[in-house]
Each structure stands twice: as C-alpha cells, then as structure tokens.
C-alpha cells in the first residue's frame, strides 16, 4: 500500500515472499510479451550488485506510458529507501550502455532468481 518516501527503514532485508512477488511479476512480463515491450524503449544498463533495486528503479522510471512495467516500477520502490524521480541517477554508477526494456527485465529476472536460490534477499 504504501506510497510515500522517507528514510526510516523497517528492516534492510526484503523477505523471501516479497522477493518472490517481484520475481513473479517479472516472469509475467516476459511470458506475456507479444509486441516489443514498451515499444522497444531503451534504458540504462545497471550493475546488478549493491544498490541494485534503487538502480533498477532509477533506470526503469524513465520509461513512461508503458503500463506493462508500471507494477514493476511500483514494486521496486518498496525495495529502495529513497524517493526516485525521472532523470535521477544517484545509484546508477555506470551510464554507458543502453539496452531494450525487455532485455533489462530478463537480466534483472535472472539475477533475482539467482539471489532467491542462494537465499540472498538483501
């Protein structure tokens, strides 16, 4: 439910159930993809390491008018402690490569599945 920014953290570790919800949403996107996702929009590639959730959100937030990823954008906000706005790149340390949203989602999904299997939820 909650909207809303702020920096007070209810705990730094996303539980497995919350991560599973995010993974399931990414799976839905990849499986239900017919036409090019988000009309083939390009986003910055990110390093799938520390600060990944905020970085992923900062990259995807710049895609507008794409209902297919709106739930993903919203879910990612629950894993990032600060407010993210379009054009903000504080967590995107490297901005030298752009990829299609579809590829970005696939890469993120593969990485999150790996983390889930390994029990790494932070």
């Amino acid at each position: 439910l909650t909207c809303l920014g702020g920096f007070a953290s209810p705990g730094p570790v996303p539980p497995s159930t919350a991560l599973r919800e995010l993974i399931e949403e990414l799976v839905n996107i990849t499986q239900n993809q017919k036409a090019p996702l988000c009309n083939g929009s390009m986003v910055w590639s990110i390093n799938l390491t520390a600060g990944m959730y905020c970085a992923a959100l900062e990259s995807l937030i710049n895609v507008s008018g794409c209902s297919a990823i709106e739930k993903t954008q919203r879910m990612l906000s629950g894993f990032c402690p600060h407010k993210v706005s379009a054009g903000q790149f504080s967590s995107l340390h490297v901005r030298d490569t752009k990829i299609e949203v579809a590829q970005f989602v696939k890469d993120l999904l593969l990485h999150l599945k790996k983390l889930f299997r390994e029990g790494q939820f932070n």
Epitope: T2, T17, A18, R20, C80
Partner: antibody
Amino acid sequence: EVQLLESGGGLVQPGGSLRLSCAASGFTFSSYAMSWVRQAPGKGLEWVSAFSGSGGSTYYADSVKGRFTISRDNSKNTLYLQMNSLRAEDTAVYYCVQDGLGPYFYNYGMDVWGQGTTVTVSS
Amino acid sequence: SYELTQPPSVSVSPGQTASITCSGDKLGDKYACWFQQKPGQSPVLVIYHDSKRPSGIPERFSGSNSGDTATLTISGTQAMDEADYYCQAWDSSTYVFGTGTKVTVL
C-alpha cells in the same frame, strides 16, 4: 480479487478494550505490509498503525501509542488491532488497508481498503 | 509532528479544472498519494508516486509534487468527482494524511 473484511467493532465503555480483526484474501498476505486507518464521524482520515511484511516491524500514531497493539497471523491471513484504555476520541470507523511490498512498504501506495468496522466509545 | 495542509473546499463547474493543493515541509522529497472518498464509502487511491494513476482511475486525474506542495488536478471535472480528497505522505516512521478537501461540482 483482493478483499479485506473487518470485524470486531461495537460499543464499549471508556477505559474498555476491543479487538478488531481483518480477514484478507486474494493476495500473498505475508508479503505485504498492512495498516489500520480510522475516521471519526464527520472528520478526516487518521492513520493508526502499520505492520510491515518484512521482518515484523510495527508502527503507531502518537495518539494510540502504548494503548493499541497491531499484530498479524500470516497462517490465517488475518490482521488484528488490540485496543485498550479506549477513550471517547477513539470513536471512529476503522479501516483495514493493504499496504506496500518490501522493506520500504510506505513507498507503494495504499491500494485496497476494507469496508470498515465501527467502534463507539461511550458510557 | 509532520503536517499536511489542504484547503477545506474547492468548487468547480462541470467540465472545468479543479486543483487541490497539499502543503508540507519538503513534501517534494517524499512520495505523495491522493485518495478520493465519497459519502458512506471507503477511500480509493487515485494517485501514487506523486503522479501515477492506478489502473481503473480515469486519465482526468493527474498529480505533481515539488518543493513544499503536491497538487491533484481533475481536468474536465464530472459530477461523479464530487467527493472528499486526501493527500498522504510518510514521515519519520508514520503516515500522515492531509486535512482533506471537499470538492463540490456546481
């Protein structure tokens, strides 16, 4: 379809206790934070308490801190609000709300609200 | 404690634009949400993340948030939009609701 059904409201005397329940269905209850929000007759919305879905942290409005206790039973998909030392100003409709996902649930937006249960504190 | 202030009432003619403001210290640094509540009904989320609309919310509802003010705009206001509107934000481990604005469609 996501549904929230509150129960347990009623008439109670000042100083008394009441426990509200909220039965949830249609979503993975344990993944989501949940909140209670109340609305006194003819007044605005007031957030009461929240229970995160990530590690069991609880949050309270100053007006109820030390008197109300939020809890949840993920095996029963149920959220609770134990209200003690009730006062006349606690009279309100109490809404159960599906909150956000993840450790920073408050960034998400309160999507789904129950129909509310009425609590009246009066002698 | 953190406070969000809204005008008590806003009047608008059908088809015209209604703007509701929500003021709070550095509100632009937080995500703002907006809720619509009609008499006898539960609140409904109409805007989250400052300007995003949940599915099912008409395009005439839009939002913005910067500085100390968040704004809900209803373009081409219809009679069915007559309701109370509340902004909301999170500050220091608590949710805060705005004081509420009654929108009347003349």
